[in-house]
Interface confidence: medium
């Protein structure tokens, strides 16, 4: 931002009545009037080009220094060229000296060259040459000093000329400040600038109305340079939740808007499923039956538990059953829908139920599921089971009622027996199987059948209460299909698939385990 | 010595034209704003016109403007006065006259000039 | 224009008499004003500059004073070769005007 200049001392806009002590008196220097483009203007001027030796000095009144530290001193000033007076006037010059002198009172008309500094000797970047003169063309320079820092209560200026043939047109005495400050939403007050050329006075800002400080950031500040522009800005302010920045302020969200938090993001429209909100919102409440989790972001729409799986198939296989269903037809707004499945069994005969989570075995996990699927076994046989898999998501557990579906199903038989060929010569096959340890119990006998491969006219059967047995007499070399089935009170379980095992030829005799 | 000499006045009828010259000598005549002043029997004196050093820029009384022009010749001294459309009241003796702004101790000029030397005069009368 | 009155339009006075010229403007020119003299049949000489400069080779019993629109031209001491018109011309303006004269006469 551009400097602001206070001004102390303004020759040319007081029209010729500071009335300036000029020393000697009644010689030299000497207030005059003109005209410039049809205006009065006045100037002090001095010419005494032809006397030699000249020390005449023109000195403004007091100056009341105020707060600045650093004054500027702007001339405005034209100066002849010295070869424009006959003979060149060989005792005349082309510049001026300026002075100050600081003070703490008004001296009146008591002037002491003595107390006077030095700034600086003023010389025209353009003289005015006799064509100029002639011609009415002014050639008006201007030049700036500054110094600092001043410490007493008022200060003078002072001209010496040494034999020029000058006009001081404007002389202005100001000092700069940094003007008032909106920046990054923060405001920084009107501020001295500071008097030495290389430092930079620090200046806090403070948030406006409704902005705050992000949490982590840097608080305003700027920097008031000597010629009174604003640097180097560090931190900003960020309107507060609820309000959003509109030009240099933070304005409330309009009704139906919010803001959830301090940032640079405008207000956002309240989402779906929320109710109307007040001006100046946060958020925007739920509508009744919507929720939103706590990892939810304030913009999501607001969203429901899902309904239930749309529709459940429980498909027994033997003592295995696969669970299939579909996705809810309501998600409830949401896409972090996780299914639950669990089992109870209930007993024919008794009628007695209980939770089975832990004598069956499901394929996996049966709590978070992601899939619409899973498969239970080590079913008992003749057991009633009921499985109920619910749906759930993220807000699910803001609400009491469940959304879940049921299927049941009933284990008429033993799972299939798992066979195994332990052992062959080349007129025996020693085989073993197993089936669940929670079916075993029900198992009677266990009947093994078993024929040549080909011969679908003749089979042999053989019972057993154990776990295997040796089938003998058979031929070598020959592939047989051998089945093992268990025997329930309640009759024939499932059997196992059907398994071909060969005999030993003669020339490989001997028992060899597989 | 400064010396500004008028000549070509004389009697015209009214309506017709005249032309004045000055014959300037003694100075750098280029250095030289020049003017006309007249003055009418037994009256004051009275500014006609004016032209800068180099031949601009020219001003005029409103009382001749459009009838009367200025110029001068550098490479020959000389200054002149076209007068057209004579009127009764241009009867008057018409003075040269010059200033040099070299011997005006003042850092800015003045906004017009005053006449630091001045010919003897040339008599202009119109009359039928 | 700006109008230049003088006073009086005439006088009389004896060899050695202070005589004072009064010049008023109808309008501030600051100093911007010079004294003439006019002896019958002569041209016109320049007498004061800037109202209160003396031109070159004008006899030092000649001053000028004043500024704004207020200004004299005093002879301290009246000689013969004094006697004469006297004009005032204001330059602050490119329309040049001078006063009507101030004839001074032997008494």
């Known amino acids: 931002a551009q400097g602001k200049e206070v001004v102390l001392l303004d020759f040319a806009a007081a029209g010729g009545e500071l009335g300036w002590l000029t020393h000697p008196y009644g010689k030299g220097w000497d207030l005059m009037q003109n005209i410039m483009n049809d205006m009065p203007i006045y100037m002090y001027s001095v010419c005494n080009v032809m006397s030699g030796d000249q020390d005449n000095w023109l000195r403004t009144n007091w100056v009341y220094r105020g707060e600045a530290e650093r004054i500027f001193i702007e001339l405005k000033f034209t100066v002849r060229d010295c070869n424009s007076f006959p003979g060149g006037a060989s005792s005349c010059k082309e510049t001026f000296n300026l002075y100050y002198a600081e003070s703490d009172l008004d001296y009146g008309t008591n002037f002491q060259k003595r107390l006077f500094t030095k700034i600086d000797t003023i010389a025209p970047d353009e003289i005015t040459v006799s064509s100029d003169f002639e011609a009415r063309h002014v050639k008006l320079n201007v030049e700036e000093r500054s110094v600092g820092p001043l410490t007493r209560k008022g200060f003078y200026l002072a001209f010496q000329d040494i034999g020029a043939c000058v006009a001081l047109l404007s002389v202005r005495v100001y000092y700069k400040k940094c003007p008032e400050l909106l920046q990054g939403l923060a405001h920084f007050p009107e501020t001295i600038a500071g008097s030495d050329a290389p430092s930079l006075a620090t200046v806090a800002g403070t948030c406006v109305d409704h902005a705050v400080v992000p949490p982590g950031g840097e608080e305003p500040r700027m920097h008031c340079a000597v010629d009174g522009e604003w640097l180097v800005p560090i931190g900003q302010c960020l309107c507060q939740a609820g309000y959003e920045k509109v030009e240099d302020a933070c304005q409330a969200c309009s009704p139906g808007f919010f803001k959830f938090e301090a940032s640079e993001s405008p207000c956002l429209e309240c989402p779906e499923h929320t109710l109307p909100s007040p001006e100046g919102a946060t958020s925007c409440e739920c509508e009744e039956g919507f929720f939103r989790a706590p990892q939810d972001p304030a913009s999501m729409p607001c969203t429901r538990p899902p309904s239930a799986p749309h529709y459940l198939t429980a498909v027994g296989m033997g003592a295995k059953v696969e669970l299939r269903w579909t996705p809810p037809q309501d998600s409830g707004g949401r896409e972090d829908i996780v299914y639950s499945v669990t089992c109870e069994q209930c007993w024919p005969e008794s009628g007695e139920c209980g939770p089975c989570e832990a004598s069956v075995r499901y394929s996996e996990p049966p709590h978070g599921l992601t899939r619409t699927s899973v498969t239970v076994s080590d079913l008992e046989p003749h057991m009633n089971y009921t499985f109920t898999v619910e749906a759930r998501n993220g807000v699910s557990g803001l609400v009491t009622s469940r959304s879940f579906r049921t299927a049941s199903v009933s284990i008429n038989q033993t799972e299939p027996p798992k066979v195994r060929l332990e052992g062959r010569s080349t007129t025996s096959l020693s085989v073993s199987w197993s089936i669940p340890p929670p079916q075993q119990s029900r198992v009677w006998k266990y009947e093994v059948t078993y024929r040549k491969k080909g011969d679908s006219n003749s089979y042999n059967v053989r019972r057993t209460e154990g776990f295997s047995v040796t089938l003998d007499d058979l031929a070598p070399d020959t592939t047989y299909l051998v089945q093992v089935q268990a025997l329930t009170q309640e009759g024939q379980g499932a059997g196992s698939k059907v398994h071909e095992f060969q005999t030993l030829s003669p020339e490989g005799s001997g028992n060899l385990a597989v | 010595e400064v010396q500004l000499l008028e000549s070509g006045g004389g009697l015209v009828q009214p309506g017709g034209s005249l032309r004045l010259s000055c014959a300037a000598s003694g100075f750098t005549f280029s250095h030289y704003m020049m003017a006309w002043v007249r003055q009418a029997p037994g009256k004051g004196l009275e500014w006609v016109s004016r032209?800068?050093?180099?031949?601009?820029?020219?001003h005029y009384a409103d009382s001749v403007k459009g009838r009367f022009t200025i110029s001068r010749d550098n490479s020959k001294n000389t200054l002149y006065l076209q007068m057209n459309s004579l009127r009764a009241e241009d009867t008057a003796v018409y003075y040269c006259?010059?200033?040099?702004?070299?011997?005006?101790?003042?850092?800015?000029?003045?906004?017009?000039?005053?006449?630091?030397?001045w010919g003897q005069g040339t008599l202009v009368t119109v009359s039928s | 224009d700006i109008q230049m009155t003088q006073s009086p339009s005439s006088l009389s006075a004896s060899v050695g008499d202070r005589v004072t010229i009064t010049c008023r403007a109808s309008?501030?020119?600051?100093?911007?004003l010079a004294w003439y003299q006019q002896k019958p049949g002569k041209a016109p000489k320049l007498l004061i500059y800037?109202?209160?400069n003396l031109h070159t080779g004008v006899p030092s019993r000649f001053s000028g004073s004043g500024s704004g629109t207020e200004f004299t031209l005093t002879i301290s001491s009246l000689q013969p070769d004094d006697f004469a018109t006297y004009y005032c011309?204001?330059?602050?303006?490119?329309?040049?005007?001078f006063g009507q004269g101030t004839k001074v006469e032997i008494k």
């Open positions: 006259a010059g200033y040099d702004s070299g011997y005006d101790y003042v850092a800015v000029a003045g906004p017009a000039e005053y006449f630091q030397h």
């Open positions: 309008q501030s020119i600051s100093t911007w």
């Open positions: 800037k109202a209160s």
């Open positions: 011309q204001q330059y602050q303006s490119y329309s040049r005007t």
């Open positions: 032209i800068g050093p180099s031949g601009g820029p020219t």
